[in-house]
Interface confidence: medium
């Protein structure tokens, strides 16, 4: 039977009355246009909604925007457009919300053609009040907050100037000209690239990488011949042009650019690209594009210094620079990532890793599903997940996969069951164990969201027709109840819930359309009365993550340790609550070969845990560049996986000798790097 129709599905008692009392409608006094929504702060209940309406006239576009504020999670909204002097706000810059709970908001206004600079509206009290500030420049990008200090802002101007404010946008100073890209690093450091000869595009591959650690008082050139740069975890990456040809290589620094090492990754040509797929303080997933317009490349995983890389996954789907990849970090379980590969017959298949890229496998076929037309063998196939690429291809996939760190083990995604991703209308699948096993949760495409740290899942059918029904589940998607939230169906445009999945409120956004008018409308439903009591100790059960063989002493060991979680029982209908903290008990595992990646010059044959020497490197000395010196590597082929905490057990030998030879590649060697002060 279909999910939610089993006899054992108990109904939540009196839910219609409970939800009806907690359903709040707000009709916005607006022509339809577009709407954007931002949450201000965490657990504050403050939402800002910006509606914009463009009237294209013959000579120019006349625009009108309205700003609304809610402080009760969207149940009620107040029109606060007068606080921004009824100014038209530029939607392409969005609403720049400050980090953490700073309560800061910056809105960028549309200004008339001849003005000297742009205009912003600033709030530091969760949008209760705004201050208008005229800028001495026209912004090219949204204001970027320093992660460490929300009073520090940076922005690029349309003239390629780098502007900094130290007092939350009150006063601005241009600290450098001819800037292409600027990013905040740690400790209020700014990294940026500059051009010398004309433009960012013309100088691509000849840019300089600069650093300022004092907001523009002094500068240091930390790299030359730069194509681009990126930050990931504690790593600073730069792609650098080779001396002799048009290829470029990745260099990496872990000390803010003072010293650099050449990453042991293939160089790429003009038409290729590198992409940091994911990074944390331990390691990096790097995609290296294949030559030619193939649409795929190779994923490499780094060691703890970001220098030595192991091949992780071949034929990884990634269409073009800035294009589409399905690479997804499953945040509800440590070490799990999902992505797509392009097979030889040009079909697309989903792969999953449970050990941070060490090994990839297909997703297990859901028990309650049959193989579709893509399957050669109707009894053997896998689940394939729709993500960014499917969405870009305009398939009937309204949402990417969803997981939340505090909803342990839960992954929700659209998928198809066969030998490859199908273009047929997908269904929605759920995993409650971080991707090891899957169940069909809903027939056909849906929007979905997680509330109360997994205590409630909410879904709305994806339809071109107006809707008035929402579905919800209190048992991780096994059984579903439907609630009609309005008599008059609306054209649905989106589900909004507070980031972090701790809230019990969901807002359904859409518009009503009558013969003459079209208005934005939101329905906010509070589920607090469905989960009418707080969860107690008896509502939780112990769950061992990554468990595949309970008989095995090492069961659950991933990256050198296992974790037991306290998880809400599916049968318990209670509130985790806003203050819910995931309870986990880690324990260290003995080291096995699974805790080691293959070292530089080694690889793992399929279905083998041993690392063997790459044939082309047999008998060669293994030398690589580290901190600008050539190093000789003595290894029996293994290196500890970054972040792996195992102890004892197997312990392969690994030693690195300094060859005392320079190998700075195209970078200025540290002693020659120049500094200057303003």
């Amino acid at each position: 039977s279909a999910p939610g129709e089993d006899e054992e599905c108990g109904r939540v008692r009196d839910f219609v009355a409970k939800l009806a009392n907690n359903t709040h409608q707000h009709v916005f006094d607006d022509l339809r246009g577009s709407v954007s929504l931002s949450w201000v702060g965490d657990s504050t209940g403050v939402i800002l909604v910006l509606t914009t309406f463009h009237v294209p006239l013959v000579i120019m576009t006349f625009g009108q925007s309205k700003l609304y504020r809610s402080e009760d999670y969207g149940k009620n909204f107040k029109d606060i457009t007068d606080l921004i002097n009824n100014t038209f706000i530029r939607t392409e810059f969005g609403m720049a919300i400050g980090p953490e709970n700073s309560g800061k908001v910056v809105l960028t206004a549309e200004v008339s053609g001849g003005s000297r600079g742009g205009r912003i509206f600033r709030s530091s009290d969760f949008a209760k009040n705004f201050v208008q500030t005229d800028l001495p420049f026209h912004p090219l990008t949204q204001m970027m907050y320093s992660p460490q200090n929300s009073d520090y802002l940076l922005a690029l101007s349309t003239e390629n100037g780098l502007w900094v404010s130290k007092n939350f946008g009150g006063k601005w100073e241009e600290i450098h000209k001819a800037v292409c890209l600027a990013k905040w690093g740690s400790d209020n450091t700014i990294f940026f690239t500059t051009y010398a000869n004309g433009s960012c595009k013309a100088d691509l591959g000849a840019l300089e990488l600069w650093r300022t650690s004092d907001l523009g008082k002094s500068f240091k050139t930390i790299g030359v011949k730069i194509y681009s740069f990126g930050l990931g975890g504690r790593f600073l990456f730069a792609s650098v042009m080779a001396d002799k040809d048009t290829t470029r290589r990745i260099h990496v620094s872990t000390d803010q650019g003072d010293t650099w090492s050449m990453a042991q990754l293939p160089s790429v040509g003009q038409e290729q690209f590198y992409s940091i797929l994911a990074a944390n303080d331990d390691m990096v997933f790097m995609h290296v594009d294949e030559p030619g317009d193939t649409g795929f490349g190779t994923i490499f995983t780094s060691d703890d210094r970001g220098i030595v890389y192991s091949k992780s996954l071949d034929r990884h789907l990634y269409t073009t620079t800035g294009g589409e990849t399905d690479f997804t970090n499953v945040t509800s379980l440590r070490g799990v990532y999902i992505t797509s590969v392009l097979s030889e017959d040009n079909s697309i298949q989903t792969m999953i890793t449970f050990d941070q890229g060490g090994r990839w496998t297909h997703l297990r076929k859901p028990e309650n599903s049959e193989c579709d037309a893509t399957a050669k063998n109707k009894n053997e196939c896998s689940l394939h997940i729709h993500a960014s690429y499917s969405i870009s291809q305009k398939l009937n996939v309204p949402m990417a996969p969803l997981s939340e760190p505090n909803a342990v083990g839960i992954v929700i995604a659209h998928g198809s069951v066969g030998d490859a991703i199908s273009v047929m209308v997908p269904d929605v699948y759920i995993s409650d164990d971080g991707g090891y096993s899957w169940t069909k949760m809903l027939e056909g495409p849906h929007y979905y969201t997680i509330l109360d740290s997994g205590g409630i899942i909410v879904a709305i059918e994806h339809s071109s027709r107006p809707i008035n029904v929402i579905k919800f589940s209190t048992d991780e998607g096994q059984c579903w109840q439907t609630y009609t939230f309005t008599r008059d169906p609306i054209y649905f445009t989106g589900l909004a819930s507070e980031p972090g999945a701790r809230s019990m409120n969901i807002s359904i956004w859409g518009f009503t359309e009558s013969f003459l008018t079209s208005q934005w409308v939101s329905y906010t439903i509070d589920f607090k009365d469905i989960l009418e009591r707080n969860c107690e100790e008896k509502d939780y059960t112990i769950w061992l993550a990554h468990s595949t063989d309970p008989e095995d002493y090492e069961d659950g060991c991933i990256l050198g340790y296992k974790e037991q979680f306290l998880r809400l029982r599916k049968s318990s209908v209670c509130q985790n609550g806003r203050d819910y903290v995931v309870t986990k008990q880690p324990s260290i595992c003995l080291c096995s070969l699974e805790d080691f990646l293959c070292d530089f010059g080694y690889y793992r044959p399929e279905n083998d845990s041993k690392c063997v020497e790459q044939p082309e490197l047999k008998g060669h000395d293994l030398e690589f560049c580290l901190y600008g010196r050539e190093e000789h590597l003595t290894t029996n082929g293994y290196r500890k996986i970054p972040g792996d905490k195992c102890q004892g057990g197997v312990n392969p030998v690994r030693e690195v000798k300094d060859l005392k030879k320079k190998c700075t590649s195209n970078f200025l060697s540290p002693e020659k790097q120049n500094s200057k002060s303003n």
Epitope: L342, N346, E370, A373, S390, A420
Partner: antibody, heavy 129, light 107 residues
């Protein structure tokens, strides 16, 4: 086993309409598109259109636009093809065919086509005054 | 629409011989091409999909090749049951279109 069973032969007068049914069994009905193809006596195959059983969206060949309507009933796993304003040149055998059109999402280079892998036995429609 | 042209219209071959059938598209259809066999009084039967992949249960003597605009169906050693009409069909762009067919007859 997987099969498509079509309704019986029809004799119609010019200007009338005909509705041919095609009942699917042995597979999940909603997972495959269905195409309709016709073949006039002694002639080749001519594609008429395609229907997606989920949602019922359709795409018709220009030649039949305005005269053909394809529908489906998911409760009985049946698709229907109705052709109106019949003329003598509509005399033909009409086939439904399961069409896993582009069912494997292909990479950037191209889509991948699986072909019409299961066909109905055909329904003969004769238009004669 | 994409026009599919098959040649020859009729091919006379002796049993055991090799038969080569051609199909040309008026514009590129990539590998989105299928071949069908039809015997008198029967529905068509899928032989090849994706230009070169044999459908389930199709003998190895049938093979398809080509990509873009030029395609070939080869029957390596004709058996008596292979004498029939063969159609190619593209599914690159709607509407799907068939070639006019090639009749393979006994010489």
């Amino acid at each position: 086993q997987v099969q498509l069973v079509q309704s019986g032969a029809e004799v119609k007068k010019p200007g009338a309409s005909v509705k041919v049914s095609c009942k699917a069994s042995g597979y999940t009905f909603t997972k495959y598109y269905m195409s309709w193809v016709r073949q006039a006596p002694g002639q080749g195959l001519e594609w008429m259109g395609i229907i997606n059983p989920i949602g019922g969206s359709t795409s018709y060949a220009q030649k039949f636009q305005g005269r053909v309507t394809m529908t489906r009933d998911t409760s009985t796993s049946t698709v229907y093809m109705e052709l109106s304003s019949l003329r003598s040149e509509d005399t033909a055998v009409y086939y439904c065919a399961r069409d896993p059109f582009g069912i494997a999402l292909a990479g950037p280079a191209s889509r991948y086509y699986y072909g019409m892998d299961v066909w109905g036995q055909g329904t003969t429609v004769t238009v004669s005054s | 629409e994409i026009v599919m042209t098959q040649s020859p219209a009729t091919l006379s071959v002796s049993p055991g011989e090799r038969a080569t059938l051609s199909c040309r598209a008026s514009q590129s259809v990539s590998s989105n091409l299928a071949w069908y066999q039809q015997k008198p009084g029967q529905a068509p039967r899928l032989l090849i999909y994706g230009a070169s992949t044999r459908a389930t249960g199709i003998p190895a003597r049938f093979s398809g090749s080509g990509s873009g605009t030029e395609f070939t169906l080869t029957i390596s050693s004709l058996q008596s049951e292979d004498f029939a009409v063969y159609y190619c069909q593209q599914a690159r762009l709607g509407p799907w279109t068939f070639g006019g067919g090639t009749k393979v007859e006994i010489k």
